[in-house]
Interface confidence: medium
């Protein structure tokens, strides 16, 4: 469809509330350091302008693209260069280069303090101005996560408001709010990581990589839907995510709503698990569809071998329509294997493709590809064994101990990576234990590998900004589906030159005593990484001793009447002790 005014079209489709929310998210994801009030002003101006275009689509500037309108707004900010430096250089470019330039300046690791919920203050804000409270939430999440899936953020903002509606009435606001906010925070962080991986796959590996990922995932979830139906959804979904990852949030949200509508209208041919989703309002409906439970497999599925090994026409099918044939293979394999991770399914499809590529050029192709399915077993065994070993380690060490084991493992593999990144990534990798190891056997593999893909993507995203390790670059860029096996296969870096011992790194202060448990752990784990960078060959025994001594030293000083004085006296002794243990 062509519209005289794109902004008027989106305003009418989305309605004022969602329109304003999405515009706020868009600006917050680009200008991550601007105060909330500045963004509100921009949103107000854009909304007023959109309304004039709704009233008269021929009004001045209404025919401009949304990129042009948004870009002009950003570039009109007087303090742009002062606050954002070379982001202002984008303003010298024309569209579409200007928008591409803005996208490249998004910061995945902005220097913004962690949000600490204060129930009393938050309830006061909520009761004073609900609309502002909603906007502030969108702003705070969007600026910290510049690739957050915008329509999904609108959904989380509704849930956030609901939590406050309920808990601000409660006698003990904190007891009601804190666990709910923490639960929501985990969901939001997972959602951010999932979307970041989707955007990375589109931007770094192309739309086809994203479509293959979606085809496998949707085939697992909707095994009753036929290939054609899944393909249509995959195509539409790719468009939605391409738009959101590209900053076209209004178009993205609009197209997502259309896709939800289509899925619900055709749910009879897609899945039996969508009924209750389709009765919900728009944002809840889209979220529910995205999280829908896996449908049961059809009872009459034929052996895969028939179409993909025994059929004499395999090479004809492969040669004449490669993508469709391989797509059908991936669909058929995925719907039969809800227990496999998406990455594993894509690795299997790659092996199948490589085998046909080789065999179909030979004299007797059927004899050559007859055993292709046997080649898949090692691909399945590798992650299964790895998960088994790591879950055993997790059971033995507990979450904190398991994280420390991963810190040691990854610091030895890639010691060039910055300490904060190693700590963040290893801590997140360590959470796979509590997330997945308790799951039933048939869910463990997909749970673990798909979660690890999210965490390793975070490492890749952070490393790309300041590349320091060729090994990391290689694992991140060579193959999306082989990232996890690539990192797993890395061995300790023997070429690494140990860091000088810097005493300041091991200097601690009284603030350590009042820190929440997780922040205390981060301090200790930061010291552990620094220790390993200084002594990469430290034994497990030495590291255990140092960590034990560290815990004793902190406990002693936090129990002393004058914390700071104790740290000042005992700190240097602890440093000498460390050096002695590692000598």
């Amino acid at each position: 469809d062509t519209y005289k005014s794109e902004i008027a079209h989106r305003f009418k489709d989305l309605g004022e509330q969602y329109f304003k929310g999405l515009v706020l998210i868009a600006f917050s994801q680009h200008l991550q350091q601007c105060p909330y009030e500045e963004h509100v002003k921009l949103v107000r101006e854009v909304t007023e302008f959109a309304k004039t275009c709704v009233a008269d689509e021929s009004a001045e500037n209404c025919d401009k693209s949304i990129h042009t309108l948004f870009g002009d707004k950003l570039c009109a900010i007087p303090s742009l260069r002062e606050h954002y430096g070379d982001l202002a250089d984008c303003c010298e470019k024309e569209e579409p280069e200007r928008n591409e330039c803005f996208l490249q300046h998004k910061n995945d690791n902005p220097d913004i303090p962690k949000l600490k919920p204060d129930p009393v203050a938050l309830c006061a804000d909520f009761q004073e101005d609900e609309q502002k409270f909603w906007g502030k939430y969108l702003y705070e999440i969007a600026r910290r996560h510049p690739y957050f899936y915008a329509p999904e953020l609108l959904y989380y903002a509704i849930i956030y408001k609901d939590v406050f509606s309920e808990c601000c009435q409660a006698a003990d606001k904190a007891a009601c709010l804190l666990p709910k906010i923490e639960h929501l925070r985990e969901k939001v962080l997972t959602s951010a990581a999932k979307q970041r991986l989707k955007c990375a796959s589109i931007q770094k590996f192309g739309e086809r990589a994203f479509k293959a990922w979606s085809l496998a995932r949707l085939s697992q979830r909707f095994p009753k839907a036929d290939f054609t139906e899944i393909s249509k959804i995959v195509t539409d979904l790719a468009k939605v995510h391409k738009e959101c990852c590209h900053g076209d949030l209004l178009e993205c949200a609009d197209d997502r709503a259309d896709l939800a509508k289509y899925i619900c209208e055709n749910q009879d041919t897609i899945s039996t698990k969508l009924k209750e989703c389709c009765d919900k309002p728009l944002l809840e409906k889209s979220h529910c569809i995205a999280e829908a439970k896996r449908d049961e497999l059809p009872a009459d599925l034929n052996p895969l071998e028939h179409d993909f090994v025994e059929d004499k026409e395999v090479c004809k099918n492969y040669k004449e329509a490669k993508h469709v044939f391989l797509g059908t293979f991936l669909y058929e394999y995925s719907r039969r294997h809800p227990d496999y991770s998406v990455s594993l399914l894509l690795r299997i499809a790659k092996i199948y493709e490589a085998t046909l590529e080789d065999c179909c050029a030979k004299e007797d192709p059927p004899a050559c590809y007859a055993t292709v399915f046997d080649k898949f077993q090692p691909l399945v065994d590798e992650p299964k064994n790895l998960i088994k070993q790591n879950c055993e380690l997790f059971e033995k060490l507990g979450e904190y101990g398991f994280q420390n084991a991963l810190i040691v493992r990854y610091t030895k593999k890639v010691p060039q990576v910055s300490t904060p990144t190693l700590v963040e990534v290893a801590r997140k990798l360590g959470l796979v234990g509590s997330r997945c190891c308790k799951r039933p056997e048939e869910e463990r593999l997909s749970c673990a590998e798909d979660y690890l893909s999210l965490v390793l993507n975070r490492l890749c995203v952070l490393h790309e900004k300041t590349p320091v390790s060729e090994k990391v670059t290689k694992c991140c860029t060579e193959s999306l589906v082989n990232r996890r096996p690539c990192f797993s296969a890395l061995t300790p870096d023997e070429t690494y030159k140990p860091k000088e011992f810097v005493e300041g790194t091991f200097t601690f202060h009284a603030d350590l005593c009042t820190l929440p448990e997780d922040e205390k752990q981060i301090k200790k784990q930061t010291a552990l990484v620094e220790l390993l960078k200084h002594k990469p060959h430290a034994t497990e025994e030495q590291l255990r001793t140092v960590l034990g001594n560290f815990a004793a030293f902190v406990q002693k000083c936090c129990a002393a009447p004058d914390h700071e004085a104790c740290f000042a006296v005992e700190g240097p002794k602890f440093v000498i002790e460390i050096r002695g243990i590692l000598a």
Partner: nanobody, 126 residues
Framework: EVQLLESGGGLVQPGGSLRLSCAAS????????VAWFRQAPGKEREFVAG????????YYADSVKGRFTISRDNSKNTLYLQMNSLRPEDTAVYYC???????????????????WGQGTLVTVSS
């Protein structure tokens, strides 16, 4: 649910021609593997010709290659089988079959097709 309805059968002399049609109710028939099978009295059902979905890749049984042509008209949601140089051994009930969601994979195995028409009789006799 996919409904298939064949037409065009009848009595024809050896060497003559017939064109069978199969109208489908499925909205994605253009992207679906569809085929013609036949069953002569007292014999097994056998594959005659097939056409892949999306990309029109065609497949034929050796016994009909060069004489029969399978095609479809996506705008009419209809599959055709043009039969020339007919022989008495082509006498059979001809069925149209569909495998939705299986573009390309036109199997020659009847059991793999979930949807069938009711059949149309072709008799080749002088």
């Amino acid at each position: 649910e996919v409904q298939l309805l064949e037409s065009g059968g009848g009595l024809v002399q050896p060497g003559g021609s017939l064109r069978l049609s199969c109208a489908a109710s499925y909205r994605y028939i253009d992207e679906t593997a569809v085929a013609w099978f036949r069953q002569a009295p007292g014999k097994e059902r056998e594959f005659v010709a097939g056409i892949g979905g999306g990309v029109d890749i065609t497949y034929y049984a050796d016994s009909v290659k060069g004489r029969f042509t399978i095609s479809r008209d996506n705008s009419k949601n209809t599959l055709y089988l043009q039969m020339n140089s007919l022989r008495p051994e082509d006498t059979a009930v001809y069925y149209c079959a569909a495998r939705p969601g299986r573009p390309l994979i036109t199997s020659k195995v009847a059991d793999l097709y979930p949807y069938w028409g009711q059949g149309t009789l072709v008799t080749v006799s002088s």
